[in-house]
């Protein structure tokens, strides 16, 4: 059965946009004007996971690329990566846990918690041009709040 998906961009709470940094990494930086076209467009798929009024499980693929954000252990630390998948099999309604994020809406802001590693969140640094990463703290220096902008198909 087909998976419900939508196209969107994400900006952190400081209005930094997400762009590709090499083939398998995202970074966050402020963009303006025509540079906004550099930001990545996600295909957000609604998938199996814990669902409630303010929590929706999603997978974040890069639109028209066979790449998904995934959470894995590297050197015993939960780590965010872009993982290549077989486009014939993805997206699917029941994704492997490493691809699943709990999209949590709080006060019109979004958090993306790893389903594989509870209490670890997609994060950006205060500094410009730094990698998007998986962070284990909320409310500290690092930014875990995002806004979503819908993109027409």
């Amino acid at each position: 059965a087909p998976v419900r998906s939508l196209n969107c961009t994400l900006r952190d709470s400081q209005q930094k946009s997400l762009v590709m940094s090499g083939p398998y990494e995202l970074k966050a930086l402020h963009l303006q004007g025509q540079d906004m076209e550099q930001q990545v467009v996600f295909s957000m798929s609604f998938v199996q996971g814990e669902e409630s009024n303010d929590k929706i499980p999603v997978a974040l693929g890069l639109k028209e690329k066979n790449l998904y954000l995934s959470c894995v252990l590297k050197d015993d630390k939960p780590t965010l990566q872009l993982e290549s998948v077989d486009p014939k099999n993805y997206p699917k309604k029941k994704m492997e846990k490493r691809f699943v994020f709990n999209k949590i809406e709080i006060n019109n802001k979004l958090e993306f918690e790893s389903a594989q590693f509870p209490n670890w969140y997609i994060s950006t640094s205060q500094a410009e041009n730094m990698p998007v990463f998986l962070g284990g703290t909320k409310g500290g220096q690092d930014i875990t709040d995002f806004t979503m902008q819908f993109v027409s198909s």
Epitope: A1, P2, Q48, G49, E50, K92, K93, K97
Partner: antibody, heavy 119, light 107 residues
């Protein structure tokens, strides 16, 4: 309170087609997936397939060539058809609901229908 | 075909802890679910998404899932917990059940 009530022929001859229907009472029909599972006597559970309100299906590969699951949203019903049955298809057949709030798994089940295939 | 392997039987004394395992290739990268089935009855969901309990399921039921093994744990096992238990997970496009474990509460 959600209730799933199922019915269909309980005795079949080899090569005939098994037909079962499940009616859903209470709760929305369109927000869920609807599944069929079977259990041969004294054995474990086997997932047959599922359908959503729009008619999109997933089937167990081992049964796919013989199975059709259909839906009638106007009646809040869904049905199972299994063709060319043999004695190996003798089982209790269950219908069930897969809910997003439980991670798209089977949170409500029908009472089960014993289907016997015998010549 | 994907395979989920469970021990055919587990025995436990009343009040003790029962652990039922379910093993499968990279099972920890999928979500695991557990059902309880008593004789002549339809299965009942007792654990979903690895470790969550549906409303009405007692707190003594818990679950975990990592590596290649999911585990259903029943602490302070009671006589009424005697039943068959099935694990389940998703395999690409279809659901797979384990073979089932008969839990016997001794005494």
């Amino acid at each position: 309170q959600v209730q799933l009530q199922q019915w269909g022929a309980g005795l079949l001859k080899p090569s005939e087609t098994l037909s079962l229907t499940c009616a859903v009472y209470g709760g929305s029909f369109s927000d869920y997936y609807w599944s069929w599972i079977r259990q041969p006597p004294g054995k474990g559970l086997e997932w047959i397939g599922e359908i959503d309100h729009s008619g999109s299906t997933n089937y167990n590969p081992s049964l796919k060539s013989r199975v059709t699951i259909s839906v009638d949203t106007s009646r809040n019903q869904f049905s199972l058809s299994l063709s060319s049955v043999t004695a190996a298809d003798t089982a209790v057949y269950y219908c069930a609901r897969a809910s997003p709030s439980s991670g798209w798994t089977l949170d409500y089940w029908g009472q089960g229908t014993l289907v016997t295939v015998s010549s | 075909q994907s395979v989920l392997t469970q021990p055919p039987s587990v025995s436990v004394s009343p009040g003790q802890t029962a652990s039922i395992t379910c093993s499968g290739d990279k099972l920890g990268d999928k979500f695991a679910f557990w059902y309880q089935q008593k004789p002549g009855q339809s299965p009942v969901l007792v654990i979903y998404l690895d470790n969550k309990r549906p409303s009405g399921i007692p707190e003594r039921f818990s679950g975990s899932n990592s590596g290649n093994t999911a585990t259903l744990t029943i602490s302070g096992t009671q006589a009424l917990d005697e039943a068959d238990y099935y694990c389940e997970a998703w395999a690409d496009t279809y659901e797979v059940f384990g073979g089932g474990t008969k839990l016997t509460v001794l005494g």
